[in-house]
Interface confidence: low
């Protein structure tokens, strides 16, 4: 089976603009790609299956997304801990200042969180 987790965080050194409401824009696609790449770095272990439903909201930039793991490989606490441990690396590697991290279980079907 698969476990899903809803993750929300702020990128305080980026500015939200209307292009982040349009998935066809360069800014949206570049930010989505870079965040996807970052999560592949954070959750390198075999249980990580990927992420989906990336959304951007105003508030500098608020990022909301869903993470998928093989069932039983990780829990909410570990998802949050690993992400928080990575924050300084995110600053150096991706020039992202991350704050206000929130993680929760996603009840099936996970698309309800989108």
């Amino acid at each position: 089976g698969v476990s899903f987790f809803f993750l929300s965080f702020h990128i305080s050194n980026l500015q939200f603009n209307s292009s982040l409401e349009d998935p066809s824009t360069d800014y949206y696609q570049e930010l989505q790609r870079d965040i996807s790449e970052m999560f592949l770095q954070i959750y390198k272990q075999g249980g990580f299956l990927g992420l989906s439903n990336i959304k951007f909201r105003p508030g500098s930039v608020v990022v909301q997304l869903t993470l998928a793991f093989r069932e039983g490989t990780i829990n909410v606490h570990d998802v949050e801990t690993q992400f928080n441990q990575y924050k300084t690396e995110a600053a150096s590697r991706y020039n992202l200042t991350i704050s206000d991290v929130s993680v929760s279980d996603v009840p099936f079907p996970f698309s309800a969180q989108s």
Epitope: E30, D34, E89, S92, N95
Partner: antibody, heavy 123, light 111 residues
């Protein structure tokens, strides 16, 4: 003052292994990546990989995967690079370097380097 | 891997004249507006020395005759007025994607 001091020159036989040390001082050791770069005669600079001492997290250049291992000892602020199955092609100067944020403005770059360790592989 | 193509291989410039070195990446090294390209100077028997980080930022203590420019895939290191102590090999480095890759180097000499 940030310093990276590497171990001395080594001469090895083909097929052997070499372990190079890099002792860091003058900064907080744990949160900064240490990069390993080598310079082969006539071949320029080549990135081998990196280690984050605080977690032991590593990233390797696929070219060296399986032959190179990075380790860190946080009690002595020392990072080690071990390269196995040596051939004459591994004759090079090996550098450790810090991926740090002492650049003005807080941006990150490889800013401080060790003095280099010459490894000669010869039968 | 991102391939960094540096040109020219060598460059002979008169003292006081301008030296220009180019580096082209096989794909964009830009991330969220930051170009993850750095320039290093290496003299014989010494480790590389950071000159320019993130394409255009001058490292502390580096003379302002050195400057960097460019974005995404095409980058330039300029020495506005070459001095005798600038004789060295210059390298670009991309830290956008693992494995990090260096350009092949440009040897700068006095004409």
């Amino acid at each position: 003052e940030v310093q990276l001091v590497q171990s001395g020159a080594e001469v090895k036989k083909p097929g052997a292994s070499v372990k190079v040390s890099c002792k860091a001082s003058g900064y907080r050791f744990i949160p900064y990546w240490i990069e390993w770069v080598r310079e082969r005669p006539g071949h320029g600079l080549e990135w081998m990989g990196e280690i984050l001492p605080g977690t032991g997290r590593t990233n390797y250049n696929e070219k060296f995967k399986g032959r190179v291992t990075f380790t860190a000892d946080t009690s002595t602020n020392t990072v080690y690079m071990e390269l196995s199955s040596l051939t004459s092609e591994d004759t090079a100067v090996y550098y450790c370097a810090r991926y740090g944020d002492d650049t003005s403005g807080g941006y990150y770059a490889v800013d401080y380097w060790g003095q280099g360790t010459t490894v000669t592989v010869s039968s | 891997d991102i391939v960094m193509t540096q040109s020219p291989d060598s460059l002979a410039v008169s003292l006081g004249e301008r030296a220009t070195i180019n580096c082209r990446a096989s794909e964009s090294v830009n991330i969220l507006g930051t170009n993850l390209i750095h320039w290093y100077q290496q003299k014989p028997g010494q480790p590389p020395k950071l000159l320019i980080y993130h394409a255009s930022n001058l490292e502390t203590g580096v003379p302002d005759r050195f400057s960097g420019s460019g974005s995404r895939t095409d980058f330039t290191l300029t020495i506005s007025s070459l001095q005798a102590e600038d004789v060295a090999v210059y390298y670009c480095l991309q830290s956008r994607k693992i494995p990090w890759t260096f350009g092949g180097g440009t040897k700068v000499e006095i004409k």
